[in-house]
């Protein structure tokens, strides 16, 4: 038993990487519990996370549907145990979030070089092609697969021996660049989508550098 | 096998309480919520509340706060529920019945035999 | 509360009939809607969940729809042993609700 009153939950906010999505609120619940409903502009409220504790909740299952809608959740406040609630009578408490367009708001994921080749003066860098929880027909889809040309990399490269970098860009997951013979280079990545207004790049991967595994080399 | 055993009939006096067990065996007790749902003689089904059992969070249906309680003991994977200042409308069969996986959360996959509470002067 | 408004409340049919039941939502509950079986004097037993999954082990016979607030249980031949009171249930808001039943006999 208890006095204390629900709170409406605060500070709705959406953190996504790559599609993989989770809604997470205030405040930590004292005599209180949550349940998640997330919908579409058009769409039905579909309940998610219930009679929750925790203060988060994870929507991926939901907005992998369709990537390209935009979300609204909100987090409904419950008293746990024989609490009052403060909502007027019969009408629950709840906030709503933001509104969430997954194709134009997930975080781009750290990237990773697959590998590198040399042949003679020229290196071929691979960036891996991760894959989604967005599905189709029952198979997960690539970041490439989902956003096609829209995804594109950015590529920083120096000599082993120098401060000085230089950068290339390519909408493929494969970037061919001019090399000095002799000479080992060290490289790394960003995804970037040249289109949107946030969230545009990705952090950067590790760097890999030749003569250390990942690549093949050809004289 | 994944089974939900009730305690006995009872048959209390108006304004009495009344506790009913409801032991689970043959699953991870802690991983599934329990609900607790009656049925008043020839009516249909009415939900009461439920209990997680891994922190003993309970909600209620308004219509019963401030009179139920629901309980768990983990040591036995047993949860209760306690009904206070009784009236004759809370004669019915009470049912515990688990909550479902992950998939389906508030679907009721396993019941209890239900206990039989009778109010009466 | 969601109101669940459970049609018809009693019928008669023919074994081998299909049998049809609704059940209408006060308002929209996506597909957080499960239908359950209970036979005098026992527990009742869950046969379909989120509107169309059928729980395991349930047969073939027995299935699920929707369309929009409305929810449709479908027995494609009805069987001696489906002689039962039906209900509905919905989730997706809170307090959890049932709907009144629809008790199915054999003519």
């Known amino acids: 038993s208890g006095t204390t009153n629900t709170v409406a939950a605060y500070n709705l906010t959406w953190k996504s990487t790559n599609f993989k999505t989770i809604l997470e609120w205030e405040p930590k619940p004292v005599n209180q519990v949550y349940t998640v409903q997330i919908s579409t502009k058009s769409g039905d409220w579909k309940s998610k996370c219930f009679y929750t504790t925790d203060t988060e909740c994870d929507l991926t299952d939901e907005i992998v549907k369709d990537v390209k809608q935009t979300y609204l959740a909100r987090v409904f406040s419950y008293p746990a145990g024989n609490v009052e609630s403060t909502g007027s009578a019969g009408e629950p408490l709840y906030e709503n979030s933001p509104e969430f367009t997954p194709y134009l708001e997930t975080n781009l994921g750290q990237p990773t070089i697959q590998s590198f080749e040399q042949v003679g003066t020229k290196v071929n860098v691979t960036v891996e092609d991760e894959r989604t929880l967005v599905r189709k027909n029952g198979t997960f889809l690539t970041l490439r697969q989902v956003f096609g040309n829209d995804l594109g990399y950015i590529l920083t490269y120096r000599k082993s021996s120098s401060s000085g970098k230089k950068t290339a860009k390519t909408n493929t997951n494969e970037f061919l660049i001019d090399v000095d013979k002799g000479e080992n280079y060290c490289f790394s990545v960003q995804a970037v989508i040249p289109s949107r207004t946030v969230n545009r790049k990705s952090t950067d991967s590790p760097v890999e550098c030749m003569g250390q595994e990942k690549g093949e080399f050809r004289e | 096998q994944v089974q939900l055993v009730q305690s006995g009939a009872e048959v209390k006096k108006p304004g009495a309480s009344v506790k009913v067990s409801c032991k689970a065996s043959?699953?991870?007790?802690?991983?599934?919520?329990m609900h607790w749902v009656r049925q008043a003689p020839g009516q249909g089904l009415e939900w009461m509340g439920i209990?997680?059992?891994?922190?003993?969070?309970?909600v209620y249906a308004q219509k019963f706060q401030g009179r139920v309680t629901m309980t768990r003991d983990t040591s036995t994977s047993t949860v209760y529920m306690e009904l206070s200042s009784l009236r004759s409308e809370d004669t019915a069969v009470y049912y515990c019945?688990?909550?479902?996986?992950?998939?389906?959360?508030?679907?009721?996959?396993?019941w209890g035999q239900g206990t039989m509470v009778t109010v009466s002067s | 509360d969601i109101q669940m408004t459970q049609s018809p409340s009693s019928l008669s049919a023919s074994v081998g009939d299909r049998v049809t039941i609704t059940c209408q939502a006060s308002?929209?509950?996506?597909?957080?809607l499960n239908w359950y079986q209970q036979k005098p004097g026992k527990a009742p037993k869950l046969l379909i969940y989120?509107?169309?999954n059928l729980e395991t082990g349930v047969p073939s016979r027995f299935s699920g729809s929707r369309s929009g607030t409305d929810f449709t249980f479908t027995i494609s031949s009805l069987q001696p042993e489906d002689i039962a009171t039906y209900y509905c249930?919905?989730?997706?808001?809170?307090?959890?609700?049932f709907g009144g039943g629809t008790k199915v006999e054999i003519k």
């Open positions: 209990i997680n059992p891994s922190g003993g969070i309970t």
């Open positions: 989120d509107a169309s």
């Open positions: 308002q929209d509950i996506s597909n957080s």
């Open positions: 043959g699953y991870t007790f802690a991983n599934y919520y």
């Open positions: 249930q919905q989730y997706n808001f809170h307090p959890l609700t």
């Open positions: 019945a688990r909550g479902g996986s992950k998939v389906a959360a508030l679907a009721f996959d396993i």
